[in-house]
Interface confidence: medium
């Protein structure tokens, strides 16, 4: 999910963050504690075990969607909730897991053969009816690889890593999701105690690529717990 | 096609409030982040101020910030730019932009001049 | 804030030449980097993004390349059309900052 700070995945070996970001949530996260707000030296996660609050589904992870947590619940108070399983109810796409959509209010396969023609229709409706790609191919395309061959490159839009192409995961920048290379050793990563600690962040970093892990550098283990650096390290 | 049209552009004196509007048309408007980005006379462009497509996340330039404030209706498909507390400095012309991807502003609009004078 | 700085601020060139234009970011934003093209009294236009990728319609004669701190936009054979000011512009980070514009005039 929003697992990283405000760092490139090109920026090796320097703790975040270069600047920040003067984001002003509205009050549905502004509400919540211990959120990360972008801007200050300082990075506190969320409680370990405190809902990650949302107000799109772009903020939450690609198994997730933004909703309230209670039935017909006050839509002021949204957190990320586990995407829904096939056969599942749901309301729109993003409420399916990946590799599923939201047909007649049922989470269903995308393999399905007359998937193509109504995920065509809605994210040609999602992103609007024109050429709203920068890639000079239909946003459609990038979005699963099972329907479509054509994989987006660095810096296109995507909805899950399975939509980049190889060497690249999709990860949040700003108000987006695009396709960002997936970080090599040495460079800075981010390492969360568990699924759902995220912080309120601006840039998403991609996982450390094969063979390599997540772990705190070796000259940092004396820092404090917050300021601790973690790197892409071989296993 | 996609349309953007800024309008609510005049003169204004110092400390004076201004708001201006951008009527988008030809694609789902509440599916993308916009921005507002001027130019001043004869000078190069600054980025001021962006907002989410639900409009739940708004960021400022430093130079406005506390001063303008960016909002938008997705029923009505409108960007908005309310300017308070306005200063010579801030005569230029004003465009709205649509983002694409991460700030990439991908369509423009044709700009409307504000100008901050006694 | 990051720091865009183009050079030159303006060049003059004949139909048919190369052109390189370059940006320059004070700290390093990756592949960040866009860069547009604006004539007098129009808005701008996107003409590449993420350092390199070329925006449907843009023609093949415009090209980018870079990543880090060092940017160039390089047109490779100049059309009357692409007398103009182009902009560089870092989206690494809020604020989001372009570089002081190059004209590129007729030589």
């Known amino acids: 999910t929003l697992n990283s700070v405000l760092n490139s995945n090109a920026i090796k070996n320097l703790p975040p963050p270069l600047g920040g970001a003067a984001g002003h949530p509205g009050s549905a996260v502004s509400a919540a504690p211990g959120i990360l707000y972008p801007g200050g030296n300082k990075y506190q996660t969320i409680d370990n075990y405190q809902p990650y609050p949302c107000a799109e589904d772009e903020e939450c992870g690609t198994d997730e969607y933004c909703a309230s947590p209670t039935r017909g619940g006050d839509a002021g108070v949204q957190i990320c909730l586990a995407c829904r399983k096939r056969r599942k109810r749901c309301m729109r796409h993003a409420m399916c897991c990946p590799g599923n959509y939201c047909k007649n209010g049922i989470c269903v396969s995308s393999d399905q053969n007359h998937f193509r023609g109504e995920i065509e229709e809605t994210i040609t409706e999602s992103f609007g009816n024109d050429h709203s790609t920068l890639d000079g191919y239909s946003r459609r395309t990038t979005l699963s690889s099972k329907m479509y061959h054509t994989k987006g490159q660095e810096g296109s839009v995507c909805l899950r890593s399975s939509d980049c192409a190889s060497g690249l995961c999709c990860a949040r920048h700003f108000w987006s999701k695009i396709c960002k290379p997936v970080l090599k050793e040495g460079q800075v990563c981010t390492k969360h105690r568990r699924k759902g600690s995220h912080g309120l962040e601006i840039f998403q970093r991609c996982y450390c690529g094969e063979g390599l892990s997540c772990r705190i550098q070796k000259d940092h283990h004396q820092a404090s717990n917050s300021s601790r650096l973690h790197t892409c390290q071989r296993h | 096609e996609v349309q953007l049209l800024e309008s609510g552009g005049g003169l204004v004196q110092p400390g004076g409030s201004l708001r201006l509007s951008c009527a988008a048309s030809?694609?789902?408007?509440?599916?993308?982040?916009m921005s507002w980005v001027r130019q001043a006379p004869g000078k190069g462009l600054e980025w001021v101020s962006a907002?989410?497509?639900?409009?739940?996340?708004?960021y400022y330039a430093d130079s406005v910030k506390g001063r303008f404030t960016i909002s938008r209706d997705n029923s009505k498909n409108t960007l908005y730019l309310q300017m308070n507390s306005l200063r010579a400095e801030d005569t230029a012309v004003y465009y709205c932009?649509?983002?694409?991807?991460?700030?990439?502003?991908?369509?423009w609009g044709q700009g409307t001049l504000v100008t901050v004078s006694s | 804030d990051i720091q865009m700085t183009q050079s030159p601020s303006s060049l003059s060139a004949s139909v048919g030449d190369r052109v390189t234009i370059t940006c320059r970011a004070s700290?390093?934003?990756?592949?960040?980097l866009n860069w547009y093209q604006q004539k007098p009294g129009k808005a701008p236009k996107l003409l590449i993004y993420?350092?390199?990728r070329l925006r449907s319609g843009v023609p093949s004669r415009f090209s980018g390349s870079g990543s880090g701190t060092d940017f160039t936009l390089t047109i490779s054979s100049l059309q009357p059309e692409d007398f103009a000011t182009y902009y560089c512009q870092q989206n690494y980070n809020t604020p989001f900052t372009f570089g002081g514009g190059t004209k590129v005039e007729i030589k």
């Open positions: 030809g694609f789902t408007f509440s599916r993308f982040a």
């Open positions: 700290h390093s934003i990756s592949s960040y």
């Open positions: 993420t350092a390199s």
């Open positions: 932009a649509r983002d694409i991807a991460a700030a990439s502003f991908d369509y």
């Open positions: 907002i989410s497509g639900s409009g739940a996340y708004t």
